[in-house]
Amino acid sequence: MSQTKMLKVRVTLFCILAGIVLAMTAVVTDHWAVLSPHMEHHNTTCEAAHFGLWRICTKRIPMDDSKTCGPITLPGEKNCSYFRHFNPGESSEIFEFTTQKEYSISAAAIAIFSLGFIILGSLCVLLSLGKKRDYLLRPASMFYAFAGLCILVSVEVMRQSVKRMIDSEDTVWIEYYYSWSFACACAAFILLFLGGLALLLFSLPRMPRNPWESCMDAEPEH
């Protein structure tokens, strides 16, 4: 592989690494969305919530003079509940959690697939760099692109989840905004998907420049 190609691959791998870090951050944190309740004028506190793939946290926040709930960073009594994804026999509460649970199961499962693809891609890259097997960069690139697509699907599932929670008559939440975990997931999708495509492009053998050349005539990579 030529020096310029190697440099492009390294830059791409650095972008992919950033995507991996962001994807991991998004998966393990629970600030995908922040939900605010309907405001009651006579209440001195309000209960905002933030959630991720694995749990929802509610927080009692003192209300300010503007009668708005938040920001969620204000100090308050925090209470987190994990979504029990893997014990479906349990009766679930019909309010916040049921709607959330069915979507978060899907999003979490898809996110795990994404992490699986990231691990496979990373193994291919490590083997490629260690043994100078450049052809392994091609499956790695595909794994990273698939990981990016899985993250995108997770993002969309969570978006639908937020929409359902806001539209539901059974939840107290009436306003929402997407938070930093969601931004991490979106950035991870862009970096992994585009990085995967770029890596595939850079790891392919040079295409023949002239009509009479064949791929076999191209200079060997090693």
């Epitope: 309740p37 309907h38 009766s91 019909i94 359902r164 539209d167 539901s168 008559e169 939840t171």
Partner: antibody, heavy 120, light 108 residues
């Protein structure tokens, strides 16, 4: 002024059918879940069932005592909810109220009630 | 389904006294999914408390709710003449929604 008005009550024989209506004025019901609650004379309140909003695909839930016999429906364009009661039994005799829940607004408005008497 | 048991069945008190009404659930309903209603003769019920402890608009602060899990309490610190009525607890934590059998607060 917000008003929920039930209609359609009356005397019916056991095994018969009746359809109750609940129409709202001064309040848009489309976002809310609509519930029916009944109360036999001198007895407590009994939740009959509810129909959820469009976002929740108009899903219905019923008390065990009426499941399979009663059907709740709604027409958001008419701001009306319905309770279709089939195979009526004498123990279904009660005042039927309609109410709603939306977000923290749980059963904040009620109708005046309509009396259903099941008797031969 | 979750069965709610209210006690006592009847509470006989004088105006100015403290009333404590209990509601026990057959299984946990969480802290957010219990409401209290007041019903006077010939009238539709009126929501007093939702989420176990949040007062609805227009409810005086002498009326308060507390509890979580399976044990809930409605307290009226000083009974006024208009407080004599039947009180129902209701859970909305799991379907089917259920009411307690009611507690009648009557004048001594």
């Amino acid at each position: 002024e917000v008003q929920l008005v039930e209609s359609g009550g009356g005397l019916v024989q056991p095994g018969g059918s009746l359809k109750l209506s609940c129409t709202a004025s001064g309040l848009t019901l489309s976002d809310s879940a609509m519930h029916w609650v009944r109360q036999a004379s001198g007895k407590g309140l009994e939740w009959v069932g509810r129909i959820r909003n469009k976002a929740n695909r108009y899903a219905t839930e019923y008390a065990a005592s009426v499941k399979g016999r009663f059907t709740i429906s709604r027409d958001d364009s008419k701001n009306t909810a319905y309770l279709q009661m089939n195979s009526l039994k004498t123990e279904d005799t009660a005042v039927y109220y309609c109410t709603r829940n939306w977000k923290i607004f749980l059963f904040d408005y009620w109708g005046q009630g309509t009396l259903v008497t099941v008797s031969s | 389904e979750i069965v709610l048991t209210q006690s006592p069945g009847t509470l006989t008190l004088s105006p100015g006294e403290r009333a404590t009404l209990s509601c026990r659930a057959s299984q946990s309903v969480g802290s957010k999914y219990l409401a209290w209603f007041q019903q006077k003769r010939g009238q539709a019920p009126r929501l007093l408390i939702y989420g176990a402890s949040s007062r609805t608009s227009g409810i005086p602060d002498r009326i308060s709710g507390s509890g979580s899990g399976t044990d809930f309490t409605l307290t009226i610190s000083r009974l006024e003449p208009e407080d004599f009525a039947v009180y129902y607890c209701q859970q909305y934590g799991s379907s089917p929604w259920t009411f307690g059998q009611g507690t009648k607060v009557e004048i001594k």
